[in-house]
Interface confidence: medium
């Protein structure tokens, strides 16, 4: 049933996060008269679109309409009819579409074109669909979590208790893990950002921020797994791949054509004497960890220090919010508690990966087998990425906070994206020129 218009003066906004593995629609709401205050925008709905990410529709663009229908209809139900025409809708596509664009700009444009035509049919104020850059994805994620944590203002916050409260206004760093890319964004301590590509300057609520960000394309959890398989099959003696990142007793047939479909495996591509190979799990955390480390090139660094693959990374500073797949995977593994040390996490992962596949299936009967089978890899990958990739240590591990939501709003880039595009983050306190979209370009 259609909601009646609310008596208070509120506004709504819709952002679709078109990720590599799925699309989610977020509905945000805020009091119209307070739109330039910090912390007033909050999420009222998340609708996960059933099906894969939009990049998978490249050969069947005629299905995009029905794909988006249910969540868009949900938005029609949630947002009062009187507000429909003034509610902006934004769609941002991330690394899955960046990869498709690398393969074919024409195909990526075709998918986006059909997405735009589908979304234009709804009664909202559609503002466009675009592939956001990795730099934007990192920046908007950083803005989201710090906005929700109340870090941009000394004013009284709209909520009483902020989780992860610190006594100062030091911002949190943002760690985002998707299916196809991962982002690290934070304010370094008095450190020159040695590579201009990784530097962002913001003025928000009267304060200047020099922010470091980088997006590692192909290092999201799904693409990292494809990379690892492509690397490991090179040295397999036959079409059996004994894989330590899968549970003992797990078996899966992989098509070589699927393995080499993504640009992320191009560097490992070779002519193999078979069209298919079988993964056979052996469930060994230590070996899995070693295999993952081979994806990170740490032998070359043209800066004072690097993450991996020659990418500059300043010394880590302050607390970090780790969200998206960092959170989902660690939540599944029951490892999000602040009290769990890095050593304990490693210990738990060793035990988890060693559990037989049949036992795992019985223990988690309601979980999709494709996802269930990959938690050993994903958990090990998260540890490898954070410790060896980003140089967190056993001591600094306690500064990582695995965050799903902050005060009911999902941690992720979508809120920051909407705040910026609707000019709701003023440069000055109380109000001046809004942060321009071009800040990120």
């Amino acid at each position: 049933t259609q909601n009646k218009a609310l008596p208070e003066n509120v506004k709504y906004g819709i952002v679709l996060d078109a990720g590599s593995s799925h699309t989610s629609l977020y509905i945000y709401k805020w009091p119209a008269e307070k739109e330039n205050d910090t912390g007033v925008v909050h999420q009222v709905e998340e609708c996960r679109v059933k099906g894969p990410g939009i990049s998978k529709f490249v050969q069947k663009v005629n299905e995009i309409g029905i794909y988006l229908t249910d969540c868009m209809e949900r938005a029609r139900e949630v947002i009062p009819r009187s507000q429909h025409q003034e509610t902006p809708v934004y769609l941002g596509a991330t690394a899955g579409m960046r990869l498709l664009r690398m393969e074919s700009e024409e195909l990526a444009d075709r998918v986006l074109d059909v997405v735009e035509r589908s979304l234009s049919n709804y009664p909202f104020d559609f503002q466009g669909a675009r592939i956001i850059t990795g730099q934007e994805e990192g920046a908007y994620g950083w803005i989201t979590i710090n906005y929700l944590l109340g870090k941009f203002s000394q004013k009284t916050r709209w909520f009483s208790i902020v989780p992860y409260e610190t006594n100062n206004q030091e911002t949190f760093g943002a760690l985002d893990l998707g299916g196809a890319s991962t982002q690290v964004t934070f304010v370094p301590q008095n450190q020159t950002i040695e590579s201009p590509d990784n530097a962002l300057q913001f003025r928000l609520y009267g304060k200047d921020y020099n922010v470091y960000t980088h997006s590692f394309l192909c290092y999201g959890k799904d693409q990292a797994l494809w990379q690892k398989l492509a690397k490991d099959i090179q040295v397999a003696s036959n079409e059996i791949l004994r894989d330590p990142c899968f549970h003992p007793g797990y078996k899966k047939v992989v098509n070589v054509s699927d393995l080499y479909k993504t640009p992320c495996t191009k560097r490992f591509e070779m002519t193999l004497p078979f069209q298919q190979f079988e993964i056979q799990g052996i469930g060994n955390y230590q070996q899995c960890h070693q295999s993952i480390l081979e994806l990170f090139n740490t032998s070359y660094c043209p800066y004072s220090q690097c993450a991996f693959n020659g990418i500059f990374l300043p010394p880590l500073q302050g607390d970090f919010g780790a969200f998206s797949a960092f959170y989902f995977v660690m939540k599944f593994l029951n490892l999000t508690s602040e009290k769990v040390s890095q050593e304990k996490v490693t210990e738990m992962m060793k035990k988890f990966c060693a559990q037989p596949w049949e036992e795992i299936k019985t223990s988690y009967a309601g979980v999709k087998e494709k996802y269930l089978s990959e938690y050993c890899f994903s958990g090990t990958y998260i540890l490898s990425l954070l410790l060896q990739g980003y140089h967190f240590t056993a001591d600094s591990w306690e500064h990582i906070h695995f965050i799903g939501k902050i005060q009911g709003s999902d941690a992720g880039w979508t809120l920051g994206y909407m705040l910026n595009l609707t000019n709701m983050i003023p440069a000055e306190q109380p109000l001046s020129t809004p942060l321009s979209h071009s800040t990120y370009v």
């Epitope: 099906g51 995009i64 229908t69």
Partner: antibody, heavy 119, light 109 residues
Framework: QVQLVQSGAEVKKPGASVKVSCKVS????????MHWVRQAPGKGLEWMGR????????KYAEKFKNRVTMTSDTSTNTVYMELSSLRSEDTAVYYC????????????WGQGTMVTVSS | DIVMTQSPDLAVSLGERATINCRTQ??????????MNWYQQKPGQPPKLLIY???SLASGVPDRFSGSGSGTDFTLTISSLQAEDVAVYYC????????FGGGTKVEIK
């Protein structure tokens, strides 16, 4: 491989209720819209309604709106359909089915549950 | 509800073409996509998806089956009838939830 396994045949008296279960294996029910379709002996297929287990949202066919309740339990990966105030014309095979999700070429159906309403 | 009408039962010789029609009371096109599906049902079995989105062949379905049409008029064609194709065929719209046609029984002449 996704499989839908339904509960066994039921015999009910007029005015009673019946609750049919549909357990999904090989995938999470939250990945689908779960539908219920019935088929009276020698007759065609009749859609009853659907549930979105992700959000516990239901849509029912007008004909069944006041008598049917669809629920889901994500912990056991099971959906349920309860039909109340049974009459003889409700004698039918009841099927649960997943809606073919865009981007995938298949849908899945349960084996069917025969419900007989007789005094 | 979208009302759907199917053509009557038909008997076709083995190897011949079988054509089943389905008409909907209102369009099942929506934002450029046609939400018409075809199912095959054999006695004692649940329905099996053959065609989705009016003309796309479901996985594992022989290519002698094809679907066509848009708007309100649709056709399922079996190009060369085989003995295993004897069944009841249902059209189904999924534009506005689900509705099934009354079914068309295909037999061998």
């Amino acid at each position: 491989q996704v499989q839908l396994v339904q509960s066994g045949a039921e015999v009910k008296k007029p005015g009673a209720s019946v609750k049919v279960s549909c357990k999904v294996s090989g995938d999470s029910i939250t990945a689908y819209f779960m539908h219920w379709v019935r088929q009276a002996p020698g007759k065609g297929l009749e859609w009853m309604g659907r549930i979105d287990p992700d959000h516990e949202r239901t849509k029912y066919a007008e004909k069944f709106k006041n008598r049917v309740t669809m629920t889901s339990d994500t912990s056991t990966n099971t959906v349920y359909m309860e039909l109340s105030s049974l009459r003889s014309e409700d004698t039918a095979v009841y099927y649960c089915a997943t809606e073919r999700v865009p981007g995938f070429e298949t849908d899945y159906w349960g084996q069917g549950t025969m419900v007989t309403v007789s005094s | 509800d979208i009302v759907m009408t199917q053509s009557p039962d038909l008997a076709v010789s083995l190897g011949e073409r079988a054509t089943i029609n389905c008409r909907t009371q209102q369009t099942v096109d929506h934002y450029g996509t046609t939400y018409m599906n075809w199912y095959q049902q054999k006695p004692g079995q649940p329905p099996k998806l053959l065609i989705y989105l009016a003309s796309s062949l479901a996985s594992g379905v022989p290519d002698r089956f094809s679907g066509s049409g848009s708007g309100t008029d649709f056709t399922l064609t079996i190009s060369s009838l085989q003995a295993e194709d004897v069944a009841v065929y249902y059209c189904q719209q999924s534009r506005n939830l689900w509705t099934f046609g009354g079914g068309t029984k295909v037999e061998i002449k």
